[in-house]
Interface confidence: low
């Protein structure tokens, strides 16, 4: 190889050893018969050189620097041509490497031809190899500002006092071109200046100078980017850290169009802005920072471009105004992420707000919008609280759980609408009064509504699901002893058209004991099937509920249980059964964890069934499903 | 306050498959990523993979693609790991662990499941 | 990927001394380095992220330091409870790696 530098080039060349490898066999620069590890060519010199070994690109690397003087004389602006070319060098991963000195009072513009240029942050790499590393300077100080692939969004990175401009080439890449130009510009007054220019959808992840290190105290960074007009951009923070300011705030500021608030200033834990139309400028500034505990300031961000949906432009109302202690959350449905650029699914507050979840709080009115490519991606869970403090004035009261008919105008689904029913320890109960009659969700007879009541324990301390309860059966009522939480959850979009069938009644009424007690009037057309709560986990410790199964006068009963034997083992007190008929009091005790349970029985009148828990074995629980089925009397038993 | 609570010991024959599972309660799940550890007996930590809690989108260590599977469900707060056509080196302590979903630390640990493969 | 080598793998000490833990990375990793304690039978336990940030209920006797790819961990005193297994942790690209751990103990 021959490589000659002329006089007034200001290039130097160093071919070094690049990272170790562990190749067993060494390889050297061989120059006149002397062998070097390291060869420096400097401007006017011409050295002829080869390698001892037949793949020197797994040992060296090559460095072309060319420092660029505008402080003494005129700027070679323009395109910026790779020399020597590369046709000239050993096949060695290259860097070239521009360093450009000139006045604090020139702005200094690295242009980028397409493709442009996209950023990447800490342990990341560019896929064919090709990377770009720009830094500036802040008087003697260097400041990175970042390093790019191809194929981005990145056009123009303007600086000021200076650019050192690196590229890097993997040995077998054939580029014989920069890609970049430089122009002079007058004086940004801040670090630099990025443009980032969209043509369509797409993301773009931009960094502060110096990621992940610290941005310099008390310095501006601007990033302006270019949004065809037909879309919409927001804004994401996906890192961020302050430091210690003593003066000042770091902030980020918007100029947004159409905004009569610019610049529109954010703090770094703000949710940024979405939504936005036209082209903007974002702005990170620093503070001057504690001397003794600095701290850093570093922001990574994602801008995600896309096409405004029907929805996005349409404004829902939701009146919160009247409510008390109700949270409305619209968010992300879980779902599998592809590979391939997914466009975000944003919910927007006063339009401008945007995020990929947003929680309503009561005692407003509230508009929203969506920016979403497929509404069915999102959907709503409320949570209500109804809780009474004082047990004289709550007695008798009664509210009505239903999903306010406002939600229904929103074009997203709705998941759960959760009531949590609050009552005073040991002095008030609650009773659910369904509109229609309901279901006990079981394997045996699973519901197939569009939505159910899923009730459940809301003490924390108390694992206690009574079950899913669904429209279409013999359930009148549900009494329950203390805190529950109510959830209607829905399963399909139809829920829109059966929403009629929706609706419960709690009413607080005096304390009781037992955990739960159902009051069933069995339907003469089918089975009904019922079972203990926390099916599955088992009945909790000591816990007692009961079911009272009303039996018309014509009709006689036949409870049946599932299994034998219920397979409980206490490891302390006694599980038991207690069947009881209510008309005459009479009554049979069955011991759980002994006895087997009875056979199949029939009931001419109106009866209770109780069970107790002892404190089981751990995977020896109590879980018991029985089923009541009722036929016409033939002779009357009176 | 947070916990993070996984299931119990599993003891299983080579070429089963087991599913762990790990449910956080004291915070919201989605606004965290979840992170799986394994231990191997009287070796030290590995990292295996973590999954959005927002998206559902697990990313796994290069060792643990193919029978590893995360996955989620939002709506009773727990993660899981499945593990399928089980071997013997796969005999290990399995964490679950709170992080971010960037530069993440793991504030807080599941207590660990033991998973015992022999035949 | 980034591979974090710990020494000493043994460190025997008294209580009341000064313990100093290392953790070296196979390229710069920044600050993107936390630090954990693991005592038989418990899980990890989280005491010092990005290299030296502290941790709220961790003992102020436990302290980091460094950035690059030099780290280290420091117990000005070492108490009986701390007698443990500590092992640190990248988090500076996937896939996040842990150091091979160093055993703490009692001399």
């Known amino acids: 190889f021959e490589i000659a530098l002329p006089r007034e080039s200001n290039i130097t060349v160093l071919i070094k050893l690049g990272t170790p490898t562990l190749l067993a066999k060494p390889c050297y620069i061989v120059i006149s018969k002397r062998h070097t590890t390291m060869l420096s060519i400097k401007p006017g010199e011409r050295i002829l050189f080869t390698f001892s070994c037949q793949s020197p690109e797994n040992h060296f690397v090559i460095e072309i620097q060319k420092n660029i003087d505008c402080m003494s004389g005129p700027c070679p602006f323009g395109e910026v041509q790779l020399q020597p070319s590369t046709s000239l060098l050993p096949t060695l991963n290259r860097t070239f490497i521009w360093d450009v000195k000139a006045h604090k009072s020139i702005g200094l513009e690295l242009q980028f031809s397409i493709p442009r240029l996209r950023q990447f942050g800490p342990g990341e790499s560019c896929p064919d190899g090709v990377t770009y590393s720009i830094s500036g300077r802040i008087d003697a100080t260097v400041v990175r500002i970042g390093t790019f692939c191809s194929n981005g969004t990145v056009s123009r990175i303007k600086m000021q006092e200076g650019v050192k401009m690196a590229l890097h080439l993997p040995w077998f890449h054939p580029r014989n071109v920069s890609g970049f130009s430089i122009a002079n510009r007058s004086s940004i007054k801040r670090l630099c200046i990025i443009e980032s220019v969209f043509e369509g959808e797409g993301s773009a992840t931009l960094m502060s100078a110096n990621y992940p290190e610290g941005f310099p105290e008390d310095e501006l960074m601007t990033w302006q980017f270019v949004i065809p007009a037909h879309l919409r951009a927001s804004v994401s923070f996906l890192n961020f850290n302050l430091s210690n300011c003593e003066r000042k705030e770091e902030r980020v500021e918007y100029y947004i169009p159409g905004s009569t608030t610019n610049p529109e200033v954010f703090k770094l834990e703000d949710k940024q802005p979405g939504n936005m139309a036209g082209n903007f400028n974002l702005s990170l500034q620093g503070c001057d920072q504690d001397a003794q505990n600095p701290g850093i300031l570093r922001l990574q961000f994602q801008v995600l471009v896309q096409h405004p949906q029907n929805e996005s432009n349409k404004i829902y109302v939701v009146d919160l105004s009247n409510e008390r202690a109700t949270s409305l959350t619209i968010e992300p449905r879980p779902v599998k992420q592809s590979r391939k650029f997914v466009p975000g699914c944003f919910v927007c507050l006063e339009s401008r707000t945007c995020s990929t979840n947003l929680t309503l709080t009561s005692g407003s009115k509230h508009k929203i919008s969506f920016l979403c490519d497929n509404l069915t991606r999102l959907w709503m869970n409320v949570e209500k609280n109804i809780s009474c403090t004082d047990h004289r004035y709550c007695q008798r009261k009664s509210y009505s759980l239903q999903v306010p008919s406002d939600i229904f105008h929103l074009p997203v689904e709705l998941h759960d609408f959760s009531w949590k029913l609050l009552v005073p320890k040991d002095r008030l109960s609650l009773v659910l009064v369904p509109a229609q009659k309901l279901q006990q969700h079981t394997h045996e007879k699973p519901c197939n509504t569009s939505f159910s009541y899923l009730v459940a324990s809301a003490i924390p301390s108390q694992d206690l699901y009574f079950g899913s309860f669904c429209p279409g059966g013999s359930i009148e009522q549900i009494q329950v002893k203390q805190n529950i939480s109510v959830t209607l959850r829905t399963f399909a979009p139809s829920f829109r058209q059966e929403a009629s069938r929706q609706g419960l009644t709690v009413s607080f009424i005096p304390y009781f004991k037992e955990e739960g007690v159902f009051t069933v009037t069995p339907d003469t057309k089918s089975k009904v099937y019922l079972r203990t709560p926390n099916w599955d986990r088992g009945l909790p410790s000591l816990t007692s509920v009961s079911w009272n199964i009303s039996v018309p006068r014509d009709q006689v009963a036949c409870l049946t249980f599932f299994k034998e034997r219920t397979g409980v083992v206490c490891q302390t007190g006694r599980a038991f059964m207690i069947i009881q008929e209510q008309r005459t009091r009479a009554e049979e005790i069955f011991s759980l964890d002994e006895d087997a349970l009875p056979k199949p029985r029939f009931h001419h009148h109106s009866f209770w069934v109780n069970i107790s828990n002892c404190s089981p074995a751990s995977g020896k629980q109590l879980d018991l499903l029985f089923w009541v089925t009722l036929t016409p009397r033939t002779v009357d038993l009176t | 306050q947070v916990q993070l609570v996984q299931s119990g010991s599993e003891l299983k024959k080579p070429g089963a498959s087991v599913k762990v599972s790990c449910k956080a309660s004291g915070y919201t799940l989605t606004d965290f990523s979840m992170h799986w550890v394994r231990q191997a007996p009287g070796q030290g930590l590995e990292w295996m993979g973590w999954i959005n809690t927002e998206t559902g989108a697990p990313t796994y260590a290069d060792d643990f693609k193919g029978r590893f599977v995360l996955s989620l469900d939002t709506s009773v707060s727990t993660a899981y790991l499945q593990i399928s056509s089980l071997k013997a080196e796969d005999t290990a302590v399995y964490y679950c662990?709170?992080?971010?979903?960037?530069?993440?630390?793991?504030?807080?640990w599941g207590q660990g499941t033991l998973v015992t493969v022999s035949s | 990927e980034i591979v974090l080598t710990q020494s000493p793998a043994t460190l025997s000490l008294s209580p009341g001394e000064r313990a100093t833990l290392s953790c070296r990375a196979s390229?710069?990793?920044?600050?993107?380095l936390h630090w954990y304690q693991q005592k038989p039978g418990q899980s990890p336990r989280l005491l010092i992220k990005y290299a030296s940030q502290s941790i709220s209920g961790i003992p102020a006797r436990f302290s980091g330091s460094g950035s690059g790819s030099d780290f280290t961990l420091t117990i000005s005193s070492v108490e009986p409870e701390d007698f443990a297994v500590y092992y640190c942790q990248s988090a500076h690209s996937f896939p996040y790696t842990f150091g091979q751990g160093t055993k703490l103990e009692i001399k």
């Open positions: 390229q710069s990793i920044s600050d993107f």
């Open positions: 662990s709170r992080g971010r979903d960037y530069d993440p630390h793991f504030d807080y």
